[in-house]
Amino acid sequence: AGTPEVWVQVQMEATELSSFTVHCGFLGPGSISLVTVSWGGPDGAGGTKLAVLHPELGTRQWAPARQARWETQSSISLALEDSGASSPFANTTFCCKFASFPEGSWESCGSLPPSSDPGLSAPPTPVPILRADLAGILGLSGVLLFGCGYLLHLLRRQKHRPTPRLQPSHTNSQALTAQAWAPSQASQAALHDPYATINTSFCPATLDTAHPNGWASLPTHAAHQPQGPAASASTPILARGSFVSVENGLYTQAGERPPHTGPGLTLFPDCRGPRALEGRFGVR
């Protein structure tokens, strides 16, 4: 069970150069609770939302998005219509953020390669997204000590690890292998982060009543990697993880509440439902 990864691939349609499709996938054992696609940068950090996909409530999309859909239980696609003659999508960054339990919020970005010819590939140039998601969550010394040790462990493991098992068969897209922090417990949620939030409503005690395909399920199958002649290489940006946190400033003191009272911060709060979850998502 490796650390979760997010891959992003941007394709230009071979038949229609003004049409683009963004494909994103989550490689991890957790249950995806929300996916946000943005352009121009990461969600909440200068990016503009194009679509939000919920596994059961549906999707929302905004121009120039044409159609957002789930391709598998762990991957999505977003078709874009470029009405401008100059094709501004060609040098735009597209980002996908997956909120999942228990891994947390993971975001990765990609763009069409400099070559605008569909089918031609360009070498990926990873650029890290630097955001202080962990600030204030743990004592600085704890973060540094634990973080450095953990990162060294990951780097050592990464160095000795073979090519990722879900590497696509062609060289035009890559499954990102960058590692980052993932949440360990919901007690971290008492601190305010308006962008990195996840569904913490996983309820083992209610698995018998949960919908078999609902949030209580843990899909483990591989994400679908788009193939085909129209696929162009995406330029991936390092995946980013974050601790469980709350999007609503009103809830920053919610750790003082007794367990199971309102949109609180216990490990297993109200177990299903968007009303119980909205306070945990910074996206819609």
Epitope: A63, G214, F281
Partner: antibody
């Protein structure tokens, strides 16, 4: 808890416009769509459109395009729905909703009468 | 637009009995990619806004009593109240959550016999 509080009832003349407000609290306003749905007396529910306050991106029901304008003011966490060229059949309760219709405002009755 | 058609338009059921409301969509609400049905059910009592009961065709919203259940796939869906209570008297709506624009059924009025 997320709450949506709408403006009060309105009586309007045919041909005029009405602007209904919806003030949101208990969530990050700019990150969630505000939907507008109307319900004529004794009738069903009809989606009018939505806005994503953070970017002011909107989607409209084709039926209302050209007559409805949805806006949002992030500084007050308030969304607005303006309907123009009112006619008697626009008499309805207008609701704002949020997060895939999981949260609803209390509704605003708009009566169009000469 | 996807057209949602509910049946019956009205329904009278005795307290403690089972109530069943059907909803048919003009297009499939099943997303083949993740095998989810994008259909929601709402309850509306007089003078109140609608209340979300079921989403994803069968997932109960938080706080909704377990006597409410949803089933179905593709174009045919059902809302079932296993044992009708007095407080369940309301109008029930199904809703297409699959594609724009979101569309609602015409409603089914549930009364006590």
């Amino acid at each position: 808890e997320v709450q949506l509080v709408q403006s009060g009832a309105e009586v309007k003349k045919p041909g005029s416009s009405v602007k209904v407000s919806c003030k949101a609290s208990g969530g990050t306003f700019s990150s969630f769509s505000i939907e507008w749905v109307r319900q004529a007396p004794g009738q069903g529910l009809e989606w009018m459109g939505e806005i994503l306050p953070g970017s002011n991106s909107t989607n409209y029901n084709e039926k209302f395009k050209g007559r409805v304008t949805i806006t949002a003011d992030e500084s007050t966490s308030t969304a607005y729905m303006e309907l123009s060229s009112l006619r008697s059949e626009d008499t309805a309760v207008y609701y704002c909703a949020r997060y895939w219709f999981a949260y609803w405002g209390q509704g605003t009755l708009v009566t169009v009468s000469s | 637009d996807i057209v949602m058609t509910q049946s019956p338009d009205s329904l009278a059921v005795s307290l403690g009995e089972r109530a069943t409301i059907n909803c048919k969509s003009s297009q499939s609400l099943l997303n083949s990619g993740n095998q989810k049905n994008y259909l929601a059910w709402y309850q509306q009592k007089p003078g109140q806004p609608p209340k979300l009961l079921i989403y994803g065709a069968s997932t109960r919203e938080s706080g909704v009593p377990d006597r409410f259940s949803g089933s179905g796939s593709g174009t045919d869906f059902t809302l079932t109240i296993s044992s009708l209570q007095a407080e369940d008297v309301a109008v029930y709506y199904c809703q297409n959550a699959h594609s724009y624009p979101p569309t609602f059924g015409q409603g089914t009025k549930l009364e006590i016999k």
